[in-house]
Amino acid sequence: ARNGDHCPLGPGRCCRLHTVRASLEDLGWADWVLSPREVQVTMCIGACPSQFRAANMHAQIKTSLHRLKPDTVPAPCCVPASYNPMVLIQKTDTGVSLQTYDDLLAKDCHCI
Amino acid sequence: ARNGDHCPLGPGRCCRLHTVRASLEDLGWADWVLSPREVQVTMCIGACPSQFRAANMHAQIKTSLHRLKPDTVPAPCCVPASYNPMVLIQKTDTGVSLQTYDDLLAKDCHCI
Protein backbone atom coordinates (compact mmCIF):
# COMPACT_ATOMS: atom_id res chain seq x y z
CA ALA A 1 0.00 0.00 0.00
CA ARG A 2 1.68 3.15 -1.25
CA ASN A 3 0.24 5.89 0.97
CA GLY A 4 0.24 9.67 0.52
CA ASP A 5 2.95 11.26 -1.54
CA HIS A 6 2.24 14.74 -0.17
CA CYS A 7 5.06 15.88 2.12
CA PRO A 8 3.71 17.89 5.07
CA LEU A 9 7.22 19.10 5.94
CA GLY A 10 7.68 21.04 2.71
CA PRO A 11 8.94 20.20 -0.80
CA GLY A 12 11.85 17.76 -0.91
CA ARG A 13 12.01 17.20 2.85
CA CYS A 14 10.34 13.80 2.88
CA CYS A 15 11.58 10.39 1.77
CA ARG A 16 12.67 10.51 -1.87
CA LEU A 17 15.43 9.49 -4.27
CA HIS A 18 18.65 11.50 -4.07
CA THR A 19 21.82 11.17 -6.15
CA VAL A 20 25.25 11.26 -4.55
CA ARG A 21 28.33 11.13 -6.76
CA ALA A 22 31.02 8.88 -5.31
CA SER A 23 34.48 7.93 -6.53
CA LEU A 24 35.90 4.41 -6.21
CA GLU A 25 38.17 5.86 -3.52
CA ASP A 26 35.12 7.14 -1.60
CA LEU A 27 33.60 3.67 -1.74
CA GLY A 28 36.83 1.83 -0.91
CA TRP A 29 36.71 0.06 -4.28
CA ALA A 30 39.68 1.64 -6.07
CA ASP A 31 41.88 -1.43 -5.84
CA TRP A 32 39.42 -3.94 -7.24
CA VAL A 33 37.06 -2.11 -9.61
CA LEU A 34 38.29 -1.11 -13.08
CA SER A 35 35.26 0.72 -14.36
CA PRO A 36 33.40 2.95 -13.77
CA ARG A 37 35.74 5.23 -11.82
CA GLU A 38 32.82 7.08 -10.26
CA VAL A 39 29.25 6.06 -9.42
CA GLN A 40 26.08 8.14 -9.37
CA VAL A 41 24.70 6.47 -6.27
CA THR A 42 20.94 6.83 -6.04
CA MET A 43 19.73 6.46 -2.48
CA CYS A 44 16.67 7.08 -0.36
CA ILE A 45 16.91 10.03 1.99
CA GLY A 46 14.32 12.07 3.87
CA ALA A 47 11.81 12.04 6.68
CA CYS A 48 8.90 9.64 7.01
CA PRO A 49 6.06 11.59 8.62
CA SER A 50 2.73 9.95 9.41
CA GLN A 51 1.64 7.60 6.60
CA PHE A 52 3.95 9.21 4.01
CA ARG A 53 4.80 6.50 1.47
CA ALA A 54 4.03 3.78 4.02
CA ALA A 55 5.34 0.55 2.50
CA ASN A 56 2.97 -1.81 4.29
CA MET A 57 0.92 -2.51 7.43
CA HIS A 58 4.08 -2.73 9.50
CA ALA A 59 5.02 0.84 8.55
CA GLN A 60 1.55 2.04 9.51
CA ILE A 61 1.84 0.33 12.91
CA LYS A 62 5.28 1.82 13.42
CA THR A 63 3.92 5.32 12.77
CA SER A 64 1.14 4.82 15.34
CA LEU A 65 3.49 3.43 17.99
CA HIS A 66 6.12 6.10 17.34
CA ARG A 67 3.47 8.74 18.05
CA LEU A 68 2.63 7.00 21.35
CA LYS A 69 6.14 6.00 22.42
CA PRO A 70 8.66 8.17 20.56
CA ASP A 71 11.49 7.20 22.91
CA THR A 72 10.94 3.48 22.37
CA VAL A 73 9.73 3.17 18.80
CA PRO A 74 11.54 5.03 16.02
CA ALA A 75 9.67 6.61 13.13
CA PRO A 76 9.58 4.64 9.88
CA CYS A 77 12.70 4.90 7.80
CA CYS A 78 13.25 5.88 4.16
CA VAL A 79 14.64 2.89 2.27
CA PRO A 80 14.68 1.53 -1.30
CA ALA A 81 11.49 -0.08 -2.54
CA SER A 82 13.28 -1.33 -5.66
CA TYR A 83 16.66 -1.17 -7.34
CA ASN A 84 18.26 -0.48 -10.70
CA PRO A 85 21.00 -2.86 -11.80
CA MET A 86 24.60 -1.77 -12.35
CA VAL A 87 27.59 -3.47 -13.95
CA LEU A 88 31.03 -3.24 -12.37
CA ILE A 89 34.12 -4.39 -14.21
CA GLN A 90 36.26 -5.82 -11.44
CA LYS A 91 39.62 -7.41 -10.87
CA THR A 92 39.69 -11.03 -9.78
CA ASP A 93 42.51 -13.40 -8.81
CA THR A 94 42.46 -14.80 -12.32
CA GLY A 95 41.91 -11.59 -14.30
CA VAL A 96 38.77 -9.52 -14.61
CA SER A 97 35.05 -10.15 -14.42
CA LEU A 98 31.86 -8.32 -15.18
CA GLN A 99 29.53 -8.36 -12.23
CA THR A 100 25.94 -7.15 -12.39
CA TYR A 101 24.71 -5.89 -9.03
CA ASP A 102 20.93 -5.86 -8.69
CA ASP A 103 20.94 -4.24 -5.26
CA LEU A 104 23.29 -1.31 -5.65
CA LEU A 105 21.30 1.67 -6.94
CA ALA A 106 17.94 2.59 -5.43
CA LYS A 107 15.21 3.09 -8.03
CA ASP A 108 12.24 3.98 -5.84
CA CYS A 109 11.76 4.76 -2.15
CA HIS A 110 9.25 4.06 0.60
CA CYS A 111 8.95 4.29 4.37
CA ILE A 112 9.16 1.24 6.58
CA ALA B 1 25.28 -10.63 2.07
CA ARG B 2 24.52 -10.75 5.79
CA ASN B 3 27.53 -9.00 7.34
CA GLY B 4 28.80 -9.07 10.93
CA ASP B 5 26.38 -9.73 13.77
CA HIS B 6 28.78 -8.40 16.41
CA CYS B 7 27.53 -5.11 17.82
CA PRO B 8 30.41 -2.72 18.53
CA LEU B 9 28.12 -0.46 20.56
CA GLY B 10 27.44 -3.04 23.26
CA PRO B 11 24.90 -5.87 23.73
CA GLY B 12 21.40 -5.08 22.48
CA ARG B 13 22.28 -1.62 21.12
CA CYS B 14 22.40 -2.58 17.45
CA CYS B 15 19.64 -3.46 14.99
CA ARG B 16 17.59 -6.37 16.29
CA LEU B 17 14.05 -7.63 16.83
CA HIS B 18 12.11 -6.00 19.68
CA THR B 19 8.60 -6.72 20.92
CA VAL B 20 6.23 -3.87 21.74
CA ARG B 21 2.87 -4.64 23.30
CA ALA B 22 0.10 -2.58 21.71
CA SER B 23 -3.66 -2.42 22.24
CA LEU B 24 -6.14 -1.99 19.42
CA GLU B 25 -6.65 1.56 20.72
CA ASP B 26 -2.89 2.23 20.46
CA LEU B 27 -2.98 1.08 16.87
CA GLY B 28 -6.17 2.91 15.96
CA TRP B 29 -7.84 -0.39 15.10
CA ALA B 30 -10.49 -0.57 17.84
CA ASP B 31 -13.33 0.23 15.43
CA TRP B 32 -12.63 -2.47 12.87
CA VAL B 33 -10.67 -5.30 14.55
CA LEU B 34 -12.46 -7.72 16.89
CA SER B 35 -9.56 -9.98 17.80
CA PRO B 36 -6.91 -10.05 19.13
CA ARG B 37 -7.49 -7.21 21.62
CA GLU B 38 -3.76 -6.73 21.96
CA VAL B 39 -0.86 -7.33 19.56
CA GLN B 40 2.71 -8.27 20.39
CA VAL B 41 4.23 -6.18 17.63
CA THR B 42 7.68 -7.38 16.64
CA MET B 43 9.71 -4.62 15.06
CA CYS B 44 13.27 -3.79 14.13
CA ILE B 45 14.98 -1.25 16.36
CA GLY B 46 18.60 -0.31 16.93
CA ALA B 47 21.65 1.30 15.45
CA CYS B 48 23.34 0.23 12.21
CA PRO B 49 27.06 0.81 12.70
CA SER B 50 29.55 0.08 9.93
CA GLN B 51 28.69 -3.16 8.08
CA PHE B 52 26.48 -4.48 10.91
CA ARG B 53 23.87 -6.74 9.32
CA ALA B 54 24.30 -4.97 5.97
CA ALA B 55 21.44 -6.17 3.80
CA ASN B 56 23.14 -5.71 0.45
CA MET B 57 25.66 -3.71 -1.59
CA HIS B 58 23.50 -0.60 -1.26
CA ALA B 59 23.78 -0.75 2.53
CA GLN B 60 27.55 -1.12 2.28
CA ILE B 61 27.77 1.93 0.02
CA LYS B 62 25.53 3.89 2.36
CA THR B 63 27.85 3.12 5.26
CA SER B 64 30.90 4.33 3.32
CA LEU B 65 29.19 7.53 2.18
CA HIS B 66 27.73 8.23 5.63
CA ARG B 67 31.27 8.11 7.02
CA LEU B 68 32.42 10.61 4.38
CA LYS B 69 29.34 12.85 4.30
CA PRO B 70 27.41 12.39 7.55
CA ASP B 71 25.36 15.56 7.00
CA THR B 72 24.22 14.45 3.55
CA VAL B 73 23.97 10.68 3.74
CA PRO B 74 22.22 9.04 6.71
CA ALA B 75 23.49 5.81 8.24
CA PRO B 76 21.74 2.63 7.17
CA CYS B 77 18.47 1.97 8.94
CA CYS B 78 17.20 -1.05 10.86
CA VAL B 79 14.22 -2.56 9.01
CA PRO B 80 12.52 -5.93 8.62
CA ALA B 81 14.26 -8.45 6.39
CA SER B 82 11.23 -10.73 6.56
CA TYR B 83 7.82 -10.97 8.20
CA ASN B 84 5.66 -13.38 10.13
CA PRO B 85 2.01 -13.58 9.11
CA MET B 86 -0.77 -12.60 11.49
CA VAL B 87 -4.51 -13.22 11.36
CA LEU B 88 -6.93 -10.46 12.38
CA ILE B 89 -10.62 -11.04 12.91
CA GLN B 90 -12.19 -7.92 11.58
CA LYS B 91 -15.59 -6.34 11.22
CA THR B 92 -17.06 -5.99 7.76
CA ASP B 93 -20.29 -4.52 6.42
CA THR B 94 -21.79 -7.99 6.36
CA GLY B 95 -20.35 -9.44 9.56
CA VAL B 96 -16.82 -10.58 10.27
CA SER B 97 -13.88 -11.87 8.25
CA LEU B 98 -10.53 -13.46 8.92
CA GLN B 99 -7.74 -11.58 7.22
CA THR B 100 -4.14 -12.78 7.07
CA TYR B 101 -1.56 -9.99 6.97
CA ASP B 102 1.83 -11.05 5.64
CA ASP B 103 3.57 -7.76 6.32
CA LEU B 104 2.60 -6.90 9.86
CA LEU B 105 5.07 -8.56 12.23
CA ALA B 106 8.81 -8.37 11.61
CA LYS B 107 10.52 -11.76 11.76
CA ASP B 108 14.11 -10.82 11.12
CA CYS B 109 16.04 -7.53 10.83
CA HIS B 110 18.80 -6.06 8.75
CA CYS B 111 20.36 -2.68 7.95
CA ILE B 112 19.69 -0.87 4.71
Epitope: L34, S35, P36, R37, V39, P85 | -
Partner: antibody, heavy 119, light 107 residues
Framework: EVQLQQSGPELVKPGASMKISCKAS????????MNWVKQSQGKNLEWIGL????????IYNQKFKGKATLTVDKSSTTAYMELLSLTSEDSAVYYC????????????WGQGTSVTVSS | DIQMTQSPASLSVSVGETVTITCRAS??????LAWYQQKQGKSPQLLVS???NLADGVPSRFSGSGSGTQYSLKIISLQSVDFGSYYC?????????FGGGTKLEIK
Protein backbone atom coordinates in the same frame (compact mmCIF):
# COMPACT_ATOMS: atom_id res chain seq x y z
CA GLU C 1 43.13 21.59 -21.64
CA VAL C 2 42.76 17.83 -22.00
CA GLN C 3 44.84 16.41 -24.83
CA LEU C 4 45.63 12.91 -26.08
CA GLN C 5 48.56 12.94 -28.51
CA GLN C 6 49.10 9.72 -30.42
CA SER C 7 52.22 8.52 -32.22
CA GLY C 8 52.48 8.87 -35.99
CA PRO C 9 51.40 6.60 -38.86
CA GLU C 10 53.07 3.22 -39.26
CA LEU C 11 53.77 0.96 -42.20
CA VAL C 12 54.65 -2.52 -40.96
CA LYS C 13 55.28 -5.91 -42.46
CA PRO C 14 52.99 -8.90 -41.89
CA GLY C 15 54.00 -10.93 -38.84
CA ALA C 16 55.67 -7.96 -37.13
CA SER C 17 54.56 -6.29 -33.92
CA MET C 18 54.32 -2.60 -33.10
CA LYS C 19 53.45 -0.24 -30.27
CA ILE C 20 51.26 2.88 -30.46
CA SER C 21 51.62 5.55 -27.79
CA CYS C 22 49.06 7.99 -26.43
CA LYS C 23 50.46 10.85 -24.36
CA ALA C 24 47.86 12.33 -22.01
CA SER C 25 48.00 15.87 -20.63
CA UNK C 26 45.74 18.40 -18.96
CA UNK C 27 44.13 16.06 -16.41
CA UNK C 28 44.91 13.55 -13.65
CA UNK C 29 46.13 10.58 -15.67
CA UNK C 30 45.40 7.95 -13.00
CA UNK C 31 41.90 9.28 -12.40
CA UNK C 32 40.48 8.16 -15.76
CA UNK C 33 40.47 4.93 -17.72
CA MET C 34 41.99 4.82 -21.18
CA ASN C 35 40.16 2.96 -23.95
CA TRP C 36 41.38 1.92 -27.37
CA VAL C 37 39.20 1.76 -30.47
CA LYS C 38 39.84 0.38 -33.97
CA GLN C 39 38.32 1.95 -37.08
CA SER C 40 38.77 -0.11 -40.21
CA GLN C 41 38.66 1.31 -43.72
CA GLY C 42 35.13 2.50 -44.28
CA LYS C 43 33.53 3.24 -40.96
CA ASN C 44 32.95 0.55 -38.38
CA LEU C 45 34.27 1.25 -34.89
CA GLU C 46 35.36 -1.58 -32.61
CA TRP C 47 36.17 -1.33 -28.93
CA ILE C 48 39.48 -3.09 -28.20
CA GLY C 49 39.67 -2.72 -24.44
CA LEU C 50 40.54 -0.44 -21.56
CA UNK C 51 43.20 0.05 -18.93
CA UNK C 52 42.74 1.57 -15.49
CA UNK C 53 45.99 3.50 -14.83
CA UNK C 54 45.33 3.64 -11.08
CA UNK C 55 45.31 -0.10 -10.41
CA UNK C 56 46.77 -1.36 -13.70
CA UNK C 57 43.74 -3.51 -14.47
CA UNK C 58 42.86 -4.23 -18.09
CA ILE C 59 39.85 -5.68 -19.84
CA TYR C 60 39.81 -6.72 -23.47
CA ASN C 61 37.21 -7.38 -26.09
CA GLN C 62 37.58 -11.15 -26.50
CA LYS C 63 38.13 -10.57 -30.23
CA PHE C 64 41.37 -8.67 -29.50
CA LYS C 65 42.77 -10.93 -26.77
CA GLY C 66 46.22 -12.01 -27.91
CA LYS C 67 46.22 -9.31 -30.56
CA ALA C 68 46.46 -6.19 -28.38
CA THR C 69 48.29 -5.56 -25.11
CA LEU C 70 47.50 -2.43 -23.13
CA THR C 71 49.96 -0.83 -20.73
CA VAL C 72 50.61 2.56 -19.13
CA ASP C 73 53.60 4.48 -17.87
CA LYS C 74 52.32 6.64 -15.04
CA SER C 75 55.51 8.66 -14.77
CA SER C 76 55.18 9.93 -18.34
CA THR C 77 51.34 9.85 -18.34
CA THR C 78 51.40 7.73 -21.48
CA ALA C 79 49.22 4.80 -22.50
CA TYR C 80 50.46 2.19 -24.94
CA MET C 81 48.87 -0.42 -27.14
CA GLU C 82 51.07 -3.13 -28.59
CA LEU C 83 49.68 -4.96 -31.62
CA LEU C 84 51.09 -8.46 -32.16
CA SER C 85 51.57 -10.71 -35.21
CA LEU C 86 50.11 -8.18 -37.61
CA THR C 87 48.15 -9.17 -40.71
CA SER C 88 46.39 -7.10 -43.37
CA GLU C 89 43.20 -7.39 -41.25
CA ASP C 90 44.89 -5.16 -38.69
CA SER C 91 45.27 -2.26 -41.12
CA ALA C 92 43.14 0.49 -39.61
CA VAL C 93 43.15 3.73 -37.68
CA TYR C 94 43.54 3.18 -33.93
CA TYR C 95 42.31 5.70 -31.36
CA CYS C 96 42.98 6.10 -27.68
CA UNK C 97 40.01 7.63 -25.86
CA UNK C 98 39.52 8.75 -22.27
CA UNK C 99 36.53 7.21 -20.51
CA UNK C 100 34.32 9.55 -18.47
CA UNK C 101 34.50 8.78 -14.77
CA UNK C 102 30.93 7.49 -14.72
CA UNK C 103 31.99 4.86 -17.25
CA UNK C 104 29.28 5.51 -19.83
CA UNK C 105 31.04 7.44 -22.61
CA UNK C 106 34.44 8.45 -24.02
CA UNK C 107 34.84 12.19 -23.81
CA UNK C 108 38.29 12.89 -25.31
CA TRP C 109 39.88 11.07 -28.24
CA GLY C 110 43.39 11.06 -29.66
CA GLN C 111 43.86 12.11 -33.29
CA GLY C 112 44.25 8.48 -34.36
CA THR C 113 47.21 6.44 -35.55
CA SER C 114 47.03 4.93 -39.03
CA VAL C 115 48.53 1.45 -39.27
CA THR C 116 49.12 -0.16 -42.65
CA VAL C 117 50.23 -3.78 -42.78
CA SER C 118 51.82 -4.58 -46.10
CA SER C 119 54.78 -6.49 -47.45
CA ASP D 1 27.77 -9.78 -27.04
CA ILE D 2 25.15 -7.04 -27.22
CA GLN D 3 24.40 -6.01 -30.80
CA MET D 4 23.67 -2.37 -31.58
CA THR D 5 21.48 -1.87 -34.65
CA GLN D 6 21.59 1.69 -35.90
CA SER D 7 19.23 3.14 -38.49
CA PRO D 8 19.12 4.55 -41.03
CA ALA D 9 22.54 3.72 -42.44
CA SER D 10 22.50 6.96 -44.42
CA LEU D 11 20.33 10.03 -44.64
CA SER D 12 20.24 12.87 -47.13
CA VAL D 13 18.70 16.01 -45.67
CA SER D 14 18.62 19.78 -46.10
CA VAL D 15 19.88 22.46 -43.75
CA GLY D 16 17.11 23.48 -41.33
CA GLU D 17 15.41 20.08 -41.27
CA THR D 18 15.00 17.83 -38.23
CA VAL D 19 16.43 14.32 -38.16
CA THR D 20 16.18 11.38 -35.79
CA ILE D 21 18.69 8.55 -35.69
CA THR D 22 17.81 5.42 -33.77
CA CYS D 23 19.80 2.69 -32.08
CA ARG D 24 18.34 -0.62 -30.92
CA ALA D 25 20.20 -2.83 -28.46
CA SER D 26 19.76 -6.59 -28.51
CA UNK D 27 19.01 -6.45 -24.77
CA UNK D 28 18.23 -3.89 -22.08
CA UNK D 29 21.24 -1.59 -21.61
CA UNK D 30 19.65 0.57 -18.89
CA UNK D 31 20.46 3.91 -20.57
CA UNK D 32 24.19 3.13 -20.65
CA LEU D 33 24.53 4.58 -24.12
CA ALA D 34 26.62 7.30 -25.78
CA TRP D 35 26.32 9.10 -29.12
CA TYR D 36 29.29 10.39 -31.14
CA GLN D 37 29.73 12.54 -34.22
CA GLN D 38 32.63 11.95 -36.60
CA LYS D 39 33.69 14.16 -39.48
CA GLN D 40 35.69 12.76 -42.41
CA GLY D 41 39.33 12.17 -41.39
CA LYS D 42 38.73 13.28 -37.79
CA SER D 43 38.31 11.55 -34.43
CA PRO D 44 34.85 10.86 -33.02
CA GLN D 45 33.46 13.53 -30.68
CA LEU D 46 31.15 12.85 -27.76
CA LEU D 47 27.64 14.31 -28.10
CA VAL D 48 25.57 12.49 -25.46
CA SER D 49 26.34 10.21 -22.50
CA UNK D 50 23.99 8.11 -20.38
CA UNK D 51 21.42 8.25 -23.21
CA UNK D 52 20.26 11.80 -22.47
CA ASN D 53 23.11 13.91 -21.04
CA LEU D 54 24.46 16.44 -23.50
CA ALA D 55 28.27 16.69 -23.40
CA ASP D 56 29.90 20.02 -22.62
CA GLY D 57 29.86 22.42 -25.54
CA VAL D 58 27.31 20.45 -27.58
CA PRO D 59 24.58 22.72 -29.00
CA SER D 60 21.07 22.33 -27.58
CA ARG D 61 19.68 21.40 -31.00
CA PHE D 62 21.00 17.90 -30.21
CA SER D 63 19.07 15.70 -27.79
CA GLY D 64 19.20 12.07 -26.73
CA SER D 65 16.31 9.98 -25.50
CA GLY D 66 15.26 6.42 -24.89
CA SER D 67 15.42 3.58 -22.38
CA GLY D 68 15.55 -0.19 -22.29
CA THR D 69 16.57 -1.30 -25.78
CA GLN D 70 15.43 1.69 -27.87
CA TYR D 71 17.39 4.97 -28.09
CA SER D 72 17.43 7.94 -30.40
CA LEU D 73 19.42 11.05 -31.22
CA LYS D 74 17.45 14.02 -32.51
CA ILE D 75 18.93 17.03 -34.28
CA ILE D 76 16.56 19.93 -34.88
CA SER D 77 17.20 22.70 -37.37
CA LEU D 78 20.23 21.01 -38.95
CA GLN D 79 23.23 23.19 -39.67
CA SER D 80 26.00 22.58 -42.19
CA VAL D 81 28.45 21.73 -39.38
CA ASP D 82 26.21 18.81 -38.37
CA PHE D 83 26.89 16.76 -41.47
CA GLY D 84 29.07 13.69 -40.96
CA SER D 85 28.71 10.25 -39.39
CA TYR D 86 26.98 9.41 -36.11
CA TYR D 87 27.57 6.38 -33.92
CA CYS D 88 25.95 4.98 -30.81
CA UNK D 89 27.85 2.86 -28.30
CA UNK D 90 26.59 0.87 -25.32
CA UNK D 91 28.35 0.53 -21.96
CA UNK D 92 26.41 -2.34 -20.42
CA UNK D 93 28.73 -5.29 -20.02
CA UNK D 94 31.68 -5.75 -22.33
CA UNK D 95 32.52 -5.64 -25.17
CA UNK D 96 31.22 -2.09 -25.51
CA UNK D 97 30.01 -2.37 -29.07
CA PHE D 98 29.19 0.47 -31.46
CA GLY D 99 26.31 0.78 -33.88
CA GLY D 100 27.08 0.55 -37.58
CA GLY D 101 26.87 4.31 -37.99
CA THR D 102 24.59 6.75 -39.80
CA LYS D 103 26.02 8.95 -42.53
CA LEU D 104 24.28 12.32 -42.66
CA GLU D 105 24.71 14.00 -46.04
CA ILE D 106 23.59 17.34 -47.46
CA LYS D 107 20.75 17.12 -49.94
Amino acid sequence: EVQLQQSGPELVKPGASMKISCKASGYSFTGYNMNWVKQSQGKNLEWIGLINPYNGGTIYNQKFKGKATLTVDKSSTTAYMELLSLTSEDSAVYYCAREVRLGNAMDYWGQGTSVTVSS
Amino acid sequence: DIQMTQSPASLSVSVGETVTITCRASENIYSNLAWYQQKQGKSPQLLVSAATNLADGVPSRFSGSGSGTQYSLKIISLQSVDFGSYYCQHFWGTPWTFGGGTKLEIK
